[in-house]
Interface confidence: low
């Protein structure tokens, strides 16, 4: 969570010929106010589309009356900042629309009248927590000068306001995997607790309690693989309707990395590798020294006493990048054998083994049948990390301890009666049928459709199924 802040410096006629007429007059005094609309991403959306990141209205400015014959000056502005709170992560890239409105204060029936004087729009990249960015935008003959920044609201910190920090009673008092919140060494990162059950492999969270899926995975806990068989490209946002990945623009298209940074695609979006002296989500922050604390994740900063000399970050184990900003994905080496789930705990790798396997890397195949006896002559069969018993005739259950009811499946055809027998079952066939399961009709002339009954057994006699 955080706040986007906009400071309007001036609104007046732009340079060049054709200075606009003043929006106010002695007969029609007026005052200005501003509206800002923010949308995530760099899309050029219609002005009417929702302000998904938020919107804000300024206070009304001082009443202004034009001096006859004078050119339109910079107009008096409202006091204070325009503040747009955002609840979730700061997206880093955003589109803005700033509108200048005139409130006429004449004798209109029904109160003041409002009219839109100017509208400017743009697309920018901005890391939260950075300095004020200055901008000039023109709309027709008008010129708007303004500054803006995004700042995180405690306890959030970071370029996207997704890390949570709290003041500590003692310096750097942070737990495993939690680092001090630079540059405030007396604050600690708070553990980010994802939704319970969120897949540690395929899910992540930027807000406590959420579970967002890496590309190729779906479901509330990111445990369901997305089918890509019918897709043209493995890139792009997932489609909820088809359950397949729809081709989309590559995250590195157009190289979002500034100041000579190189872009590489990641499962989530993209990553910029910044040259020395630059950092931030898109290498947009410059003039960095060791005093600025550019080394993340406990990296040690060396050199760089002034902005012109380079600094070097010596990264702790498990991190890399010019600012130690990238966690080494040690699980990508697939150290867990036999389908084990890899967990990178920061200080160690752990493998969560499937049933039937054990060992630090799930390398030991447990003998499922060891010490497992199948009763009543059953034999143990291994498979899938669990044992099962193949039971002798007349017995069933997990360990062959239950006597099976051979008649339960109604094996006697054509209305034959079934009788349990110590060695299996016996079918007493209805008149006109014969065979072990009463499956053969007896022909009217006394001959059967298939070979005759065994010697000593008449059609209709019980046939024991051996």
């Amino acid at each position: 969570a955080g706040v986007f802040e906009l400071q309007i410096h001036s609104f007046g006629p732009g340079p060049g010929p054709g200075a606009p007429r003043s929006p106010c007059s002695a007969r029609l005094p007026c005052r200005l106010f501003f509206r800002v609309c923010l949308k995530p991403g760099l899309s050029e959306e219609a002005a009417e589309s929702p302000c998904a990141l938020g919107a804000a209205l300024s206070a009304r400015g001082p009443v202004y009356t034009e001096q006859p014959g004078a050119p339109a000056p910079d107009l008096p502005l409202p006091d204070g900042l325009l503040q747009v709170p955002f609840r979730d992560a700061w997206p880093g890239t955003f589109s803005f629309i700033i509108e200048t409105w005139r409130e006429e204060l004449g004798d209109q029936i029904g109160g003041p009248a409002w009219s839109l004087l100017a509208r400017v729009a743009g697309r920018r990249r901005l890391a939260a927590g950075g300095p004020w960015a200055r901008d000039i935008q023109r709309a027709g003959a008008w010129e708007l000068r303004f500054s803006y920044r995004a700042r995180c609201e405690p306890p959030a910190v970071g370029t996207a306001c997704t890390r949570l920090c709290r003041p500590r009673s003692a310096p750097s008092r942070c737990g495993p995997g939690l680092r001090p919140c630079a540059p405030l060494e007396d604050e600690c990162e708070a553990p980010l607790v994802c939704r319970a059950g969120c897949s540690p492999e395929h899910g992540f969270c930027e807000q406590p309690g959420e579970c967002r899926c890496l590309e190729g995975w779906t479901g509330p806990l990111c445990t369901v693989p997305v089918s890509t068989s019918s897709c043209l490209s493995p890139r792009g946002p997932s489609s909820a309707t088809t359950g397949c990945l729809v081709p989309g623009p590559g995250p590195c298209d157009g190289n979002p990395c500034a100041n000579g940074g190189s872009c590489s695609e990641t499962p989530r979006s993209f990553e910029c590798t910044c040259p020395r002296g630059f950092y931030g989500l898109r290498c947009e922050v410059s003039g960095v020294t060791c005093a600025d604390g550019p080394c993340f994740n406990g990296g040690l900063c060396v050199g760089g006493a002034d902005p012109d000399s380079a600094y070097i970050c010596h990264c702790p184990p498990g991190f890399q990048g010019s600012n130690c900003e990238k966690r080494v994905d040690r699980c990508s080496l697939q150290p867990c054998r036999n389908g084990g789930l890899c967990l990178d705990l920061g200080h160690a790798l752990r493998c969560r083994c499937r049933a039937g396997f054990a060992g630090p890397r799930c390398e030991h195949d447990l003998d499922d049948c060891a010490g497992r006896a199948c009763a009543n002559g059953g034999t143990c069969v291994e498979g899938g990390g669990a044992h099962r018993c193949s039971c002798a005739l007349g017995f069933g259950g997990r360990d062959c301890r239950e006597r099976a009811d051979p008649c339960a499946a109604r094996p006697c055809a054509h209305g034959g009666r079934c009788y349990a027998h110590f060695s299996g079952l016996v079918c007493a066939c209805a008149p006109g049928y014969m065979g072990a399961r009463c499956e053969f009709p007896v022909h009217p002339d006394g001959a059967s459709a298939l070979p005759a009954a065994p010697p000593g057994l008449r059609p209709g006699d019980p046939q024991r199924y051996l």
């Epitope: 920090c165 709290r166 600690c188 406990g298 184990p317 200080h347």
Partner: antibody
Framework: QVQLQESGPGLVKPSGTLSLTCVVF?????????WSWVRQPPGKGLEWIGE???????NYNPSLKSRVTISVDKSKNQFSLKLSSVTAADTAVYYC???????????WGQGTLVTVSS | DIVMTQSPDSLAVSLGERATINCKSS????????????LAWYQQKPGQPPNLLVY???TRESGVPDRFSGAGSGTDFTLTISSLQAEDVAVYYC?????????FGQGTKVEIK
Amino acid sequence: QVQLQESGPGLVKPSGTLSLTCVVFGDSISSSNWWSWVRQPPGKGLEWIGEVFHSGSTNYNPSLKSRVTISVDKSKNQFSLKLSSVTAADTAVYYCARAAVAGALDYWGQGTLVTVSS
Amino acid sequence: DIVMTQSPDSLAVSLGERATINCKSSQSVLYSSNNKNYLAWYQQKPGQPPNLLVYWASTRESGVPDRFSGAGSGTDFTLTISSLQAEDVAVYYCQQYYGTSWTFGQGTKVEIK
């Protein structure tokens, strides 16, 4: 000044469920701290029971895990302990404590004696 | 679980003398990424809850007299009271908070000789 105060019945019958609540004063339960329960049988040492974060995430002592539930009530700025199937061996002074982000327990309640007896 | 073993079980020291308590963990509690030992020391007086003395194995909690000091790394740690005072009579516990399950030592009782 951070203060913690335990409350709950001092006598529980065997096989019953022990229920205790800890109210936090001077700090928000939604801060970055975790909130722990620790117990101490009469004349014996300390045993960590478990902890809870304001999101509801928990960590438990493996030896007690099957019987323990620790929960948090942000609206009342308190957290609770439930220990099921108690026996005389669960008779102890039960303390609630704040686990600073690091994990060291920097603030403790005064403790409440719970006796398991019929 | 990490097992914490303290020695000795009890210790009698003259007023003004040095008292040293040892604590050994069954596995290292040093976290290499920040080079910190996840170990704390507590003092408990009769009828009172424990009181945090030292964390990170050697960082004194604010308000704790400087006669208390912690040292050690990895698996072997010590708490030293440089000059024992009458109010230091208590039971002292070490605790590891390295993983997601924490354990205490069995305690060391410090008395005046």
